[in-house]
């Protein structure tokens, strides 16, 4: 069988949801010594980067200016060391946002609930869309989808304190073109049905995978690079529609 290098890791810097006309940045983390990185969009070559010097950096950034619906979709990357190519990375879904209109997000029975209460979010958008998306701040990969003519329901079932946080919704014109985000709605969940005093919300952190982890080689890094790269590939969870 034809020999290939381990697949690279593709990430979006800061977020995979990019407002229209803004710049998207995708990182392809490959290997020290890679002389060429290729970014593929919907299966076709989109861009090429050649790191300088190749032996000192383990990846590259691809800048995609002026984001629009034609540039939104599935990206992957590969890299080359000498004449040897890597396997293709997992697919990354890049979404353009701030298209057309702004939905309204609401929550029943209210923004303050007790653990065990049934909560339902509603996302409403009067323009032509049938797919709606609900995202929790700091958990933007955990997208919930629902369908409806002008409004979609997101039943959360009986909630726990793990549901605390700030939520936004989008209307989706296709898988990769989303509306402006709704105003956020913060959900406060107190510990139990008897205790209705307010508890603080859990802190939210940026998505840890929405960060480019490109490093310049120093000392031991080269020896650890292949092991580390293989481990990351093994544990990396990619985003699927």
């Amino acid at each position: 069988p034809k020999q290939t290098l381990p697949k690279p890791i593709i990430r979006a810097e800061s977020t995979y949801m990019v407002p229209k006309e803004k710049q998207a940045t995708l990182c392809c983390q490959g290997s020290y010594g890679a002389v060429e990185y290729q970014l593929h969009f919907e299966g076709s070559l989109f861009a090429v980067e050649r790191p300088k010097p190749p032996e000192r950096i383990n990846g590259v950034k691809f800048h995609i200016p002026d984001m629009n619906s034609r540039k939104a979709g599935r990206y992957s990357c590969i890299y080359r060391v000498g004449e040897l190519w890597s396997e293709r990375s997992d697919l990354l879904d890049l979404v353009v946002t701030e298209m057309y209109d702004t939905p309204t997000l609401s929550v029943h029975p209210g923004p303050e609930v007790t653990s065990g209460e049934k909560v339902t979010f509603y996302c409403r958008l009067d323009t032509a869309t049938s797919m709606f998306l609900l995202l929790k701040e700091g958990r933007s990969r955990d997208v919930q989808r629902s369908y409806g003519k002008v409004q979609a329901e997101f039943p959360m079932g009986p909630v726990t304190t793990a549901h605390r946080g700030s939520y936004r919704c989008f209307g989706s014109y296709n898988n990769y073109a989303w509306s402006f985000p709704s105003e956020p709605v913060k959900l406060l969940v107190t510990g139990d049905i008897e205790n209705t005093s307010l508890a603080p919300t859990d802190p939210t952190f940026p998505d840890s995978w929405d960060t480019c982890l490109l490093t310049r080689e120093t000392g031991l890094q080269k020896d650890l690079a292949l092991w580390d790269h293989t481990a990351q590939n093994h544990h990396h969870h990619h985003h699927h529609h």
Epitope: S106, H108, P109, E117, I193
Partner: nanobody, 121 residues
Framework: DVQLVESGGGLVQAGGSLRLSCAAS??????IHWFRQAPGKEREFVAR????????FYAASVKGRFTISRDNAKNMVYLQMNSLKPEDTAVYYC????????????????WGQGTQVTVSS
């Protein structure tokens, strides 16, 4: 035809009590909320009850003084208000399946017409 009709408002001395009623007809609801609106102020959540489960929730400003309950047989929801204060003066509304939309705004397809509660000092 869906209707929510409040009653029981009136003038009461500080420290006194009132019981408001909300008659719900026309369909079944998941929740009934009570709200109030004082002159020049935004509509404010007071209390809610789940129709089947009877689970209740109260705004911090009324907790321990107000009690929401319901009578399934009569399709009625009640708000028992004790230890009333002048700051409880407002028009009180009941609403069915109300939803919060952020920035202290609430929406519902079904609102009552309201009943005036005045607490004198």
């Amino acid at each position: 035809d869906v209707q929510l009709v409040e009653s029981g408002g009136g003038l009461v001395q500080a420290g006194g009590s009132l019981r408001l009623s909300c008659a719900a007809s026309g369909r079944t609801f998941n929740t009934i909320h009570w709200f109030r609106q004082a002159p020049g102020k935004e509509r404010e959540f007071v209390a809610r009850i789940w129709w089947i489960e009877r689970t209740t929730f109260y705004a911090a400003s009324v907790k321990g003084r107000f009690t929401i309950s319901r009578d399934n047989a009569k399709n009625m929801v009640y708000l028992q208000m004790n230890s009333l204060k002048p700051e409880d003066t407002a028009v009180y509304y009941c609403a069915a399946d109300a939803r919060y939309t952020g920035s202290r705004r609430w929406e519902s397809d079904y609102w009552g017409q309201g009943t005036q509660v005045t607490v004198s000092s």
